[in-house]
């Protein structure tokens, strides 16, 4: 066959769907690879062809669109399963072509099983709610296009295994779940089950997401450097190991990049000739506030090193701060015999 622009296996779009539920999968060509949409392609005389490779097989085969009750069908650039079966798992390819043009991409589709409490190997999206922030809501995701607006589905929300009913601060409102107050106790997995009729059959869509309650932007502060501080002096003799921790607290801020770095005499450690190593550790509070510690280490410090300026810097979306460490050379204890001798005028 003639040459075809092959975008390969698009593993970035690992699609997971639940067994025995409807699934609509758009051909990724139009979403991520081509500069035109399906309508333009169709009106230009291009045809969209679907085929697949079963799990643990190498053979590409056409998709059977003649199954009972049209279990698998294609509509424009969408491949429909009504519903999926476990053995639909595999790599699916959509190819757009005519006599002079060809472009194709493959993507993995995994049909997963869930238990009665909605546990499954499905990768869950995370929705962050601000702690004690006021009314916030989550919306049942990825249900658009499954039924027309004239169809009124029933939606049931669950937290973990339990149906949300008289949950005090959590109120189901159709496709939305409203949190009157978001508390740490609201952390967990929330599932919406959308039930709708189609051609005399009833279908269910199950969507689970993880809610994580995080620090409120109203409480956010610039980075706070706990160490170094004015109370600790790093007093060393030449040849000893110098260890200076820089410990910084960062309030949680959505999409903020938290940075900590050291400068030695105003330069980054990489730009200086001394043998310095820096080790970083990060810990998080329950509301995702972050504490970063960078330990600056010089194995065998010289008297020159002890005269340098060591400054810890921190930056977040809330601001930038810096703090110098107090480093000094330890004054050796007087050697008694010599001092005594000097005292008597001996040479």
């Amino acid at each position: 066959s003639e040459r075809c622009d092959d975008w390969g296996l698009d593993t970035m779009r690992q699609i997971q769907v639940f067994e025995d539920e409807p699934a609509r999968i758009k051909c990724p060509l139009f979403e991520h690879f081509l500069k035109f949409n399906y309508s333009t392609a169709h009106s230009a005389g291009l045809t969209l062809i679907w085929y697949w490779t079963r799990q643990d097989r190498d053979l590409e085969e056409p998709i059977n669109f003649r199954l009972p009750e049209n279990r698998i069908s294609k509509e424009k650039d969408v491949l429909w399963f009504r519903p999926t079966l476990l053995n639909d798992t595999g790599n699916y390819t959509c190819m757009l072509r005519n006599t002079t043009y060809c472009s194709k991409v493959a993507f993995p589709l995994e049909v997963v099983q869930k238990d009665s409490c909605f546990n499954s190997p499905m990768k869950l999206p995370v929705h962050k709610l601000y702690i004690e922030y006021g009314i916030q809501r989550i919306t049942c995701p990825n249900v658009d296009g499954y039924f027309p607006s004239s169809v009124k589905p029933t939606i049931t929300w669950y937290m973990g295994c339990y149906k949300i009913q008289n949950f005090n601060n959590v109120i189901p409102e159709g496709m939305n779940l409203s949190f009157l107050i978001a508390l740490i106790s609201n952390n967990g997995n929330y599932t919406c089950v959308v039930t709708y009729p189609e051609n005399g059959r009833t279908f269910h869509l199950t969507r689970t997401l993880t809610v994580k309650v995080v620090g409120s932007p109203k409480n956010a502060v610039p980075p706070v450097i706990h160490s170094p501080n004015d109370h600790v002096v790093y007093e060393k003799e030449p040849g000893e190991e110098l260890l200076i921790p820089c410990t910084v607290y960062f309030s949680f801020l959505m999409d903020s990049r938290n940075e900590v770095w050291w400068t030695i005499d105003g330069k980054k450690p990489d730009d200086i000739t001394i043998d310095v190593t820096i080790n970083e550790s990060i810990s998080h509070s329950r509301t995702e506030d972050e504490t970063r510690t960078q330990i600056l280490s010089i194995k065998k410090v010289t008297s020159e090193d002890l005269k340098r300026s060591y400054v810890c810097h921190a930056r977040s979306a809330k601001g930038e701060v810096a703090k110098a460490a107090k480093v000094k050379q330890k004054v050796p204890a007087p050697r008694y015999t010599v001092e005594l001798a000097c005292g008597f005028g001996a040479t």
Epitope: E132, Y133, N166, E173, G174, N176, L180, N219
Partner: antibody, heavy 119, light 110 residues
Framework: SLEESGGDLVKPGASLTLTCTAS?????????MCWVRQAPGKGLEWIAC????????TYYASWAKGRFTISKTSSTTVTLQMTSLTAADTATYFC?????????????WGPGTLVTVSS | AIEMTQTPSSVSAAVGGTVTINCQAS??????LAWYQQKPGQRPKLLIY???LLASGVPSRFKGNGSGTEYTLTISDLESADAATYYC????????????FGGGTEVVVK
């Protein structure tokens, strides 16, 4: 309990600030504080609510936006600032507490304060 | 904005009787509905919240029901102390958060 104050007889076009003071409890992240009014012989009308937590998120009836401002001034007081008052604003103004940990129930109301707008 | 329509505007019944008050929301309010009792010159008193939950200290003669856009308050075994105006109140938290009250129903006990 809740107690409203600041109600007065004012002229059209004037401004007025009402205060709601809580006693026996202090505003916490569990509560929303709201203002509702009732014109003489008429029904209840929601004006605005404020979240008592640190964010102080505010919620207004569409007709109240711009002319009414709800604020939390301390851990036990909420105010309602009203501007460009007209005779239609003559009413008893109630302060109410909404319990966010109890399905949003409006469980505590003040006795109300009367605002009269007349020339 | 949500609108709450309450019917009837007035209802009369004998002591020991039953009255039913209806409240219709202009959109689905998902059981975010409360009922209040107000006597002349007094503050409103919460009776029912979340459509059917009885507020603390309220006798079980008061019963709330309904879902979606249609809700009812039923008062059985009427007592003379039940003479008051009753208001429904709906809330919507998703989208633009708002609350709205019905126009009120006057209950006269004969």
């Amino acid at each position: 309990s809740l107690e409203e104050s600041g109600g007065d007889l004012v002229k059209p076009g004037a401004s007025l600030t009402l205060t709601c003071t809580a006693s026996g409890f202090s505003f916490s992240s569990t509560y929303y504080m709201c203002w509702v009014r009732q014109a003489p012989g008429k029904g209840l009308e929601w004006i605005a609510c404020i979240y008592a937590g640190s964010s102080g998120s505010t919620y207004y009836a569409s007709w109240a936006k711009g002319r009414f401002t709800i604020s939390k001034t301390s851990s036990t007081t909420v105010t309602l600032q009203m501007t460009s008052l007209t005779a239609a604003d003559t009413a008893t103004y109630f302060c109410a507490r909404v319990d966010g940990s109890s399905s949003g129930s409006w469980d505590l109301w003040g006795p109300g304060t009367l605002v009269t707008v007349s020339s | 904005a949500i609108e709450m329509t309450q019917t009837p505007s007035s209802v009369s019944a004998a002591v020991g009787g039953t009255v039913t008050i209806n409240c219709q929301a202009s959109q689905n309010i998902y059981s975010n509905l409360a009922w209040y009792q107000q006597k002349p010159g007094q503050r409103p008193k919460l009776l029912i919240y979340a459509a059917s939950l009885l507020a603390s200290g309220v006798p079980s003669r008061f019963k709330g029901n309904g879902s979606g856009t249609e809700y009812t308050l039923t008062i059985s075994d009427l007592e003379s102390a039940d003479a008051a105006t009753y208001y429904c109140q709906g809330a919507v938290y998703s989208g633009n958060t708002e609350w709205a009250f019905g126009g009120g129903t006057e209950v006269v006990v004969k």
